[in-house]
Interface confidence: low
């Protein structure tokens, strides 16, 4: 083996005999034929050595200590490395020790990476043998903060004046990272702060400093608990002792956000608070002890985090402070009223003002809770306006139409999320580009996704519904002439899982005169069904829509109309359809109120289908359904 320590490393390595075992044969460290039972390597030294036995891990342990001086110069903050790397060390039980000395005014924070730490008490050990021992300092006195295993909730420990951190790794453990970093903080004005983060349900057992011995006299120690919003925390004291106080009183103080009586002070013998919503702090405050008969203050307690027993205790924060022109309404789903008694279902603002429905507006954070036996009785509708007032500023600007993640945190199903897209009249138009190509919902090929986009005109005088579209089709973009509303409507709770498939980008583009243009790139595997807007009610009077249909170079598109005739009867004007080859610009014009629709026809190149309506007689509307299929091109007919 070779261990080389850089001169400036402030690292010392010590190999020494471990706990004596009743092994018959002794073992030695061999350095240049000389046998020894202890080896110390200091900065700047490079030592070559071997062991005289096959299993040195049964005899020796190795300690690697790094002294970090924050008194005389800058402190090397950041992720703490295992130096030397474990791969360069002999396979012995090893303890890495970091001894950090700092001014009283400087706070030091140990940050532990996931899986975080779990404190254990006397007589316990860690399943994998990896342990952390953490100590602090009060003047010259060392104070044990605790010993910890992996897989817990302790994410950070803040101290001041100094930290001694020991990481014990068994010889067989492959670990090559320390799992923590050091950061500097302002003075914490107490012995230490331990942060415990819960990701979900679970419990943590924690102990006062020096446990099971006595907590330092007149000291203050704080635990900060980070609890997910939907869970509740309860504290119970497993074991405690009180010292004999001369002045002041030993107590625990809770800082509970939202409480009007912070800090809430409890005696150790009191019943401790339970069912707490949100993050909270717990502090242990010692007293001035009787010099003759001090006794000891010690505390071992458990924090249990679990789902609340009923929904009414949960507080949800809906942060609309960064949203503009947005309103969120939580309201009852429409259901058939039964004659039976139905318990009330209310949504509450700030836990106090409760009603059957609630509208939250953008610009602020809202705290809400529910008093409801079954939250599936409610749903949520959101409206957001995206408007452009200055066409010079908006042109080519894009917005992402996505449901904000905050909304998924609420326990109520999203029904509709509507974006109203408003443009200056006759100045700009809109284009919708989906993250995944869209399919138009038709009777022949219905959407079977957990959500769809409903696209409709948002001009009050205009009754124009472009259709319902879901991911997984062939429509690459939808261009619309003027104001529209795009509504993401959910149909199943699985929308939360499928939410990653949502995503539309809207861009403001130069104004064009057609009511809508659909850009379609058919899939070689399936029929693309397309139908005119306002299906079943008829395309509005004098409205023109187009489909830009791309045909891949090696394919032939077959365009088929559902009926022989449209059935439209024009009161004034003419209804016509133009089919135009994009490459040659050759076009055919069909009179929809007179001619039969064309028979299935083949297109070797991309083409346009444009439909323009007349003013139809009532009841004789223009509705057109067609489909496009692709087949491989066998003979090039061009």
């Amino acid at each position: 083996f070779e261990i080389a320590l850089p001169r400036e490393s402030n690292i010392t390595v010590l190999i020494k005999l471990g706990t004596p075992t009743l092994l018959a044969k002794p073992c030695y460290i061999v350095i240049s034929k000389r046998h020894t039972t202890m080896l110390s390597i200091k900065p700047g030294e490079r030592i070559l050595f071997t062991f005289s036995c096959q299993s040195p891990e049964n005899h020796f342990v190795i300690e690697i200590q790094k002294n970090i001086d924050c008194m005389s110069g800058p402190c090397p903050f950041g992720e703490v490395q295992l130096q030397p790397s474990t791969s360069l060390l002999p396979t012995l039980n090893r303890t890495f020790i970091w001894d950090v000395k700092a001014h009283k005014s400087i706070g030091l924070e140990l940050q532990f990476s996931i899986p975080r730490l779990r404190q254990f008490g006397p007589g316990e050990s860690c399943p994998d043998g990896v342990t952390y021992s953490i100590s602090g300092r009060i003047d010259a006195t060392v104070v044990r903060i605790g010993t910890f295993c992996s897989n817990g909730t302790v994410s950070r420990i803040k101290m001041q004046e100094g930290v001694k951190m020991a990481l014990h790794l068994p010889w067989f453990h492959p670990r090559n990272v320390s799992g923590f970093s050091i950061a500097n903080r302002s003075s914490i004005k107490r012995l230490c702060i331990i942060e415990s983060v819960f990701e979900g349900e679970g419990s943590a057992t924690l102990m006062s400093a020096n446990y099971p011995e006595g907590f330092p006299e007149d000291e203050l120690m704080t635990w900060q608990f980070v609890i997910p919003a939907h869970l509740r925390a309860s504290v119970s004291f497993l074991n405690f002792n009180l010292s004999n106080c001369e002045r002041k009183e030993e107590r625990v103080e809770y800082y509970i956000p939202g409480s009007t009586t912070n800090p809430e002070v409890f005696k150790l013998e009191d019943k401790q608070p339970g069912n707490m919503a949100g993050n909270f702090n717990l502090s242990l405050q010692g007293c001035d002890q009787d010099a003759q008969n001090p006794g000891i203050l010690r505390l071992q307690f458990q924090v249990l985090v679990q789902h609340p027993q009923n929904e009414s205790n949960k507080i949800y924060v809906v942060d609309l402070s960064n949203e503009r022109a947005t309103s969120l309404t939580i309201e009852p789903r429409p259901v058939k009223q039964s004659r039976k008694f139905v318990p009330g279902c209310f949504v509450c603002l700030e836990s106090r003002t409760c009603s059957t429905n609630l509208t939250l507006t953008s610009g602020s954070k809202h705290k809400i809770s529910f008093l409801c036996d079954n939250l599936t009785r409610l749903w949520m509708n959101v409206e957001k306006n995206i408007s452009c007032t200055d066409h010079r500023y908006c042109q080519r600007k894009s917005y992402s139409l996505q449901v904000p993640s905050d909304i998924f945190h609420l326990p109520v199903e999203l029904h509709d999320f509507s974006w109203k897209l408003l443009v200056p009249k006759d100045r700009l138009s809109l284009v919708l580009v989906p993250a995944q190509k869209l399919q138009q919902h038709t009777h022949e090929k219905p959407c079977n996704t957990s959500f769809s986009y409903l696209v409709a005109s948002a001009i009050p005088s205009q009754d124009l519904y472009f259709g319902s579209f879901c991911p997984g089709g062939s429509i690459e973009q939808i261009q619309v002439k003027q104001n529209i509303s795009v509504t993401l409507r959910t149909f199943a709770p699985s929308f939360r899982q499928e939410a990653s498939r949502q995503g539309l980008t809207v861009s403001f583009i130069p104004y064009f005169k057609e009511e809508g243009v659909f850009t379609v790139t058919p899939d070689t595997k399936s029929k693309v069904y397309l139908r005119t807007p306002n299906w079943d009610r008829g395309l509005p009077s004098l409205t023109s829509v187009s489909w830009n249909i791309s045909v891949p170079r090696d394919q032939v598109a077959c365009l088929t109309f559902f009926k022989e005739r449209t059935g439209v009867v024009c009161q004034t004007g003419r209804a016509f359809m133009i089919i135009q080859e994009q490459r040659t610009r050759a076009e055919e014009i069909f009179s929809l109120d007179e001619d039969a629709l064309p028979k299935p026809r083949f297109h070797h190149h991309s083409f346009w289908v444009n439909i323009s309506n007349c003013s139809p007689a009532s009841g004789k509307q223009l509705d057109l359904l067609f489909w496009v299929t692709l087949t491989p091109r066998t003979v090039d007919l061009t």
């Epitope: 080519r396 894009s398 580009v433 993250a435 690459e476 990653s500 498939r501 980008t505 861009s507």
Partner: antibody, heavy 120, light 112 residues
């Protein structure tokens, strides 16, 4: 048909500058993030920089930060890479790539590349 | 940055035989969405790279079904069920989870 065509490569001395261009066609350019990826002669691929649809967000590999600038002109369907303070180790074929697909970073279309040689 | 490691670096294969390339990442590429953010690219001689597989196991359009991707977390495999002469080139894996995206060193597939 999606097409990306790079240009602007050539021989330049260390410390010099070049501006690469990428002309895009066959897709809605303004709807996609775009990237530059390079490949040193006989070596593997290294991502260099990318830019959001509207140009509001840009990111660079550490080795080119402060020296290279990515930009785009959606009206011209063009992507650019301004390379200053060039070093010998910047010698590579530079590819313009479209970031498509649900994983964001997936480069679903690539240009044919343009060779940049930095040599004295 | 996430480090990607491919093996083997060179892979001579007889046409019609299967081939397998391994890729390991220095940290898990499994996203909360359940996808593995790993792509495979092929760079044929004298050509630019082309996307073969995205999100670990999804074939890009136009990619023959003899190509398949598998694996999860940190270990991934690209398999070619029956190698054809046109499959020669350098295969790269790339993590698409974090910026910057990082590529493996490449595996050169050649015909025996």
């Amino acid at each position: 048909e999606v097409q990306l065509v790079e240009s602007g490569g050539g021989l330049v001395q260390p410390g010099g500058s070049l501006r690469l261009s990428c002309a895009a066609s066959g897709f809605t350019f303004s709807s996609y993030w775009m990237s530059w990826v390079r490949q040193a002669p006989g070596k593997g691929l290294e991502w260099v920089a990318n830019i959001k649809q509207d140009g509001s967000e840009k990111d660079y590999v550490d080795s080119v930060k402060g020296r290279f600038t990515i930009s785009r002109d959606n009206a011209k369907n063009s992507l650019y890479l301004q390379m200053n303070s060039l070093r010998v180790e910047d010698t590579a074929v530079y590819y313009c790539a479209r970031e498509g697909g649900s994983s964001g970073w997936t480069f679903d279309y690539w240009g044919q590349g343009t060779l940049v040689t930095v040599s004295s | 940055d996430i480090v990607m490691t491919q093996s083997p670096l060179s892979l001579p294969v007889t046409p019609g035989e299967p081939a397998s390339i391994s890729c390991r990442s220095s940290q898990s590429l499994l996203h909360s969405s359940g996808h593995n953010f790993l792509d495979w690219y092929l760079q044929k001689p004298g050509q630019s790279p082309q996307l073969l597989i995205y999100l670990g196991s999804n074939r890009a359009s136009g990619v023959p079904d003899r190509f398949s991707g598998s694996g999860s977390g940190t270990d991934f495999t690209l398999k070619i069920s029956r190698v054809e002469a046109e499959d020669v080139g350098v295969y790269y894996c790339m993590q698409a989870l974090q910026t910057p995206p990082t590529f493996g060193q490449g595996t050169k597939l050649e015909i025996k």
